[in-house]
């Protein structure tokens, strides 16, 4: 169908509550484009009827609410005047809330579930809520270890929980809860956050930590478009450079003529005591010569690589 495939990261989500994912890919969606969502390579688009439990809302896919059976790979197809890109998003739904049981709950703790408070300082936690503008979010309630937070050291300010004079007892499992209203119906959103306490001003010393990749291989079909993020945590005051290299050469220099493989523009999210940096590498079209080569993400003295490999042949097709 002429669409280039782009594989995005996995998302881990909680069942029985709303979830939304926005189909944005800056090089493409900045212009005049149409966006259509599909599930599991279905030819039938996700409904745009707002009464449907799963429906497309402008560039978003919206689940009201998410259910366990919604796990799977979703594709959004971005069509421009002269281009077509298919972005794949893998959604994994876990079934149980931590406060009800530890069984069948959050299967692993990725960075978005972790936040840090500084001992003895005034600090804050953030409730990350990402929904289209058709969703109205009510005031946020905060919980610690499954009990609503009360006390004069804690103040709720929009999406943040302000904590004054942080103590060691403030570590633990927090959750922020909001009521989301959509088309007159109300839904509860509950996000878990694991909070650790640190005395350090820096983030794990001055050596940057590469969260992803982790020195592994990625199966990718010949001819597809692939985007891989390098996610790095580092101190706020760091002077480290982050880049992608192949054969010890910057990818932009190595592929200077063809520009087939390019490094993306670096972005970062600022946390209380560190920054999370993202710089991607884009393979506009994977070629045979790319397989088996280590593509290295560098961040200061830290390095991590990915190696592209052809998927194993599926003999069931014959």
């Amino acid at each position: 169908d002429g669409c280039k495939d782009i594989f995005m990261k996995n998302e881990i989500l909680s069942a029985s509550q709303p979830f939304a994912f926005n189909c944005t890919f800056p090089p493409i969606t900045s212009g005049e484009v149409s966006v259509t969502w599909y599930k599991n390579s279905s030819k039938i688009p996700v409904s745009k009827i707002i009464q449907s439990r799963i429906h497309q809302d402008e560039t978003w896919i919206l689940f009201l609410p998410m259910e366990w059976g919604d796990s799977g790979v979703y594709q959004c197809v971005i069509k421009g005047r002269d281009s077509c890109h298919r972005i794949h998003v893998n959604l994994t739904v876990f079934e149980k809330h931590w406060c009800d049981t530890s069984i069948g709950g959050l299967p692993n703790l990725s960075d978005e579930y972790k936040q840090i408070l500084h001992l003895g300082k005034d600090d804050s936690l953030t409730c990350h809520l990402h929904f289209p503008k058709s969703c109205v979010l009510g005031p946020i309630k905060w919980y610690k270890d499954c009990n609503e937070i009360k006390g004069e050291r804690f103040t709720v300010l929009e999406t943040r929980l302000l904590v004054s004079n942080v103590s060691a007892e403030d570590r633990g499992n927090y959750a922020c809860q909001a009521i989301l209203t959509h088309s007159g119906k109300q839904y509860e959103v509950l996000n878990g956050i694991t909070v650790s306490i640190t005395e350090r001003a820096g983030y794990g010393g001055s050596v940057p930590k590469i969260i992803y990749p982790k020195n592994h291989s990625i199966e990718v079909q010949l001819g597809t478009t692939l985007i891989v993020d390098c996610n790095v945590t580092d101190t706020k005051d760091n002077t480290n450079l982050r880049c992608w290299r192949v054969n010890n050469t910057l990818v932009d220099d190595y592929y200077d003529e063809s520009k087939r493989i390019r490094e993306g523009v670096e972005t970062h999210v600022s946390f209380r005591e560190h920054n999370l940096y993202t710089v991607n590498i884009t393979f506009l079209e994977v070629k045979m010569e790319d397989y088996g080569l280590p593509f290295m993400c560098h961040a200061g003295v830290s390095t991590a690589y990915i190696i592209l490999q052809l998927p194993a042949p599926d003999f069931r097709a014959y």
Epitope: W98, C99, S102, G104, G105, L106, P107, C146, N173, T194
Partner: antibody, heavy 119, light 108 residues
């Protein structure tokens, strides 16, 4: 470092009750779930149930609902399991284990408490 | 409940040999919730492999785990004397939590 220290061995008569303790240290007790697992002599592992010290929520294996009662005392970071109406087939080593958010497995176990039921 | 069946019940091998044991679930278990424990006589179980294939802290890399759905495998590439013990598979996906009946790895 995380530690779970259980109470010592017990010998009980049939029909009696016993209360086993599990003292936690090295982490935020109310930010975990404590699970109880038993192992009869020469047998495998059998899950009894779990308790959340933060909100005192309990979930039991149906096979133990009328046998075990799990409680906590957060002031001393200790979990308890009481076994009632003891029978000889309740003779076993009883373990506590801890589970943390986003880590659905047992990274730390108590050393075990042997409960012997004999007339 | 999810029944986990381990095979073989007993595995008799010599140090230096390769050990392979399997665990079959009566219904599908997400790989994120499947784990292996090692237990030696008179000791509490010890987490060996979690999330199907990740080695727990301090576990030597001669141990490996694999599998998905209903079929999971634990492999020890080259047996050391301290590896002779009983191994249990475990699922954390559905209540009640269940364990396999164990595979006893003994010295031949």
């Amino acid at each position: 470092q995380v530690q779970l220290v259980q109470s010592g061995a017990e010998v009980k008569k049939p029909g009696a009750s016993v209360k086993v303790s599990c003292k936690a240290s090295g982490y935020s007790f109310t930010s975990s779930w404590i699970h109880w697992v038993r192992q009869a002599p020469g047998q495998g592992l059998e899950w009894i149930g779990e308790i959340n010290p933060g909100n005192v929520r309990t979930n039991y294996n149906e096979n133990f609902r009328n046998k075990a009662t799990m409680t906590v005392d957060t002031s001393i970071s200790t979990a308890y399991m009481e076994l009632s109406r003891l029978r000889s087939d309740d003779t076993a080593v009883y373990y506590c284990a801890v589970v943390f958010y986003g880590e659905p497995y047992f990274p730390y176990w108590g050393q075990g408490t042997l409960v012997t039921v004999s007339s | 409940e999810i029944v986990l069946t381990q095979s073989p019940g007993t595995l008799s091998l010599s140090p230096g040999e390769r050990a392979t044991m399997s665990c079959t679930a009566s219904s599908s278990v997400s790989s994120s919730y499947f784990h292996w424990y090692q237990q030696k006589p008179g000791q509490a179980p010890r987490l060996l492999i979690y999330r199907t294939s990740i080695l727990a802290s301090g576990v030597p890399d001669r141990f490996s785990g694999s599998g998905s759905g209903t079929d999971f495998t634990l492999t020890i590439s080259r047996l050391e004397p301290e590896d002779f013990a009983t191994y249990y598979c475990h699922q954390f996906h559905r209540s009640p939590l269940t364990f396999g009946q164990g595979t006893k790895l003994e010295i031949k």
